[in-house]
């Protein structure tokens, strides 16, 4: 004969465990029903009555089958340097990620605790490694024969244009200037942008370092055009 199906609450057989979506209540010493995602246990089970579940209130959630007495609070609203990529619902927490042009300098389990603006490489420096969602831009000095005349988190060092006759030689922060006649070959106008990043670890040293910098928080910085700009926390 097939085994009889037990309905919650029920006393488990010695040495056995409760079934999926059930939990063992120590007080009642019974297997009882868990509450589904989006709900919580309003009344715990007894020997004669099963768990009573209730929906999570606004701005609270449960993501898993559970028997918690209260739903979890959703995280605070996303800060100005973040975008909400997942809304707070009864079944999931809000997730904030850094807005474009920023990266996550300090992550948390889901989303980002601290966003910071991507480093902008100053003239004479170009992007060696682009920023990602979780890493800052790495700048490097433009090597001989290349230049960058922008302050940018995307522009790389570009080759100097080649002149028939050079009026002013180029350097790391300025393109070569040709005399009246057009250059033999000139780079396409406008800044060159890097495609998306490489994620290899670099132990760069010389001759052209590949460092990177931090975001800046004006209120913490000692001088005007300081480094990093700290974003706000996403808690």
């Amino acid at each position: 004969l097939p085994a009889q199906v037990a309905f919650t609450p029920y006393a488990p057989e010695p040495g056995s465990t409760c079934r999926l979506r059930e939990y063992y209540d120590q007080t009642a010493q019974m297997c009882c029903s868990k509450c589904s995602p989006g709900q919580h246990a309003k009344v715990f089970c007894t020997k004669t009555s099963d768990t009573v579940c209730d929906s999570c209130e606004d701005s609270t959630y449960t993501q898993l089958w559970n028997w918690v007495p209260e739903c979890l609070s959703c995280g605070s609203r996303c800060s100005s340097d973040q975008v909400e990529t997942q809304a707070c619902t009864r079944e999931q927490n809000r997730i904030c990620t850094c807005r474009p042009g920023w990266y996550c300098a300090l992550s948390k389990q889901e989303g980002c605790r601290l966003c910071a603006p991507l480093r902008k490489c100053r003239p004479g420096f170009g992007v060696a490694r682009p920023g990602t969602e979780t890493s800052d831009v790495v700048c490097k000095p433009c090597a001989p024969g290349t230049f960058s005349n922008t302050t940018s988190s995307t522009d790389i060092c570009r080759p100097h244009q080649i002149c028939n006759v050079v009026a002013i030689p180029g350097n790391a922060s300025m393109d070569a200037v040709c005399t009246s006649t057009s250059p033999t070959r000139s780079m396409a106008p406008g800044a060159v942008h890097l495609p998306q990043p490489v994620s290899t670890r670099s132990q760069h040293t010389q001759p052209t370092p590949e460092p990177s910098t931090a975001p800046s928080t004006s209120f913490l910085l000692p001088m005007g055009p300081s480094p990093p700009a700290e974003g706000s926390t996403g808690d």
Partner: antibody, heavy 121, light 107 residues
Framework: EVQLVESGGGLVQPGGSLRLSCAAS????????LSWVRQAPGKGLEWVAY????????YYSDTVKGRFTISRDNAKNTLYLQMNSLRAEDTAVYYC??????????????WGQGTLVTVSS | DIQMTQSPSSLSASVGDRVTITCRTS??????LPWYQQKPGKSPKLLVY???KLAEGVPSRFSGSGSGTDYTLTISSLQPEDFATYYC?????????FGQGTKVEIK
Amino acid sequence: EVQLVESGGGLVQPGGSLRLSCAASGFAFSTYDLSWVRQAPGKGLEWVAYINNGGISTYYSDTVKGRFTISRDNAKNTLYLQMNSLRAEDTAVYYCVRGPFYGSANYFDYWGQGTLVTVSS
Amino acid sequence: DIQMTQSPSSLSASVGDRVTITCRTSESIYSNLPWYQQKPGKSPKLLVYDATKLAEGVPSRFSGSGSGTDYTLTISSLQPEDFATYYCQHFWVTPWTFGQGTKVEIK
């Protein structure tokens, strides 16, 4: 207030190892690049090592490359310098410094008080 | 490596004097040059960055100038608290070397 506090210095024999730590506070540690600079007794300043904010890029001076390793723990707001195969010429006060924000803000803006490392038999 | 030649290595001056310290690099560093002040037994302090910009809280008697390979730190009117050692540094390609230092002493 920005604070950088070094620890871990001391007397070590040639060929030995030492690990320096730098506890940082007063700023968003994980957004700043950091370096170690040293100063031998009565001598000038020498840049030793650099690590970017995410710990992805590191640079070393030729004098320590292959022997020293710079690292950081952004969750603990701490910078480290693991020093192996120490030599007498590594004897110096080691400063933990904030910066450069390389390629963007190229300077050391805050310095720790320093920790003395003495390599001698 | 980029060589940093700082001069003079020491100088004696009186309060009120105008003091000039120079730093020459073996190749252009595109003004990526800070100046630091260090007093005996103390950590260095940032004075000037990007060759010409005064760090916050630094008195206006300090100024920086120069570009390319030649840079200067000037103290327009030396004060008693300015007696110290001054260092230039470059932040172009690694290694980021410092000048040898200039010790400013009381005459």
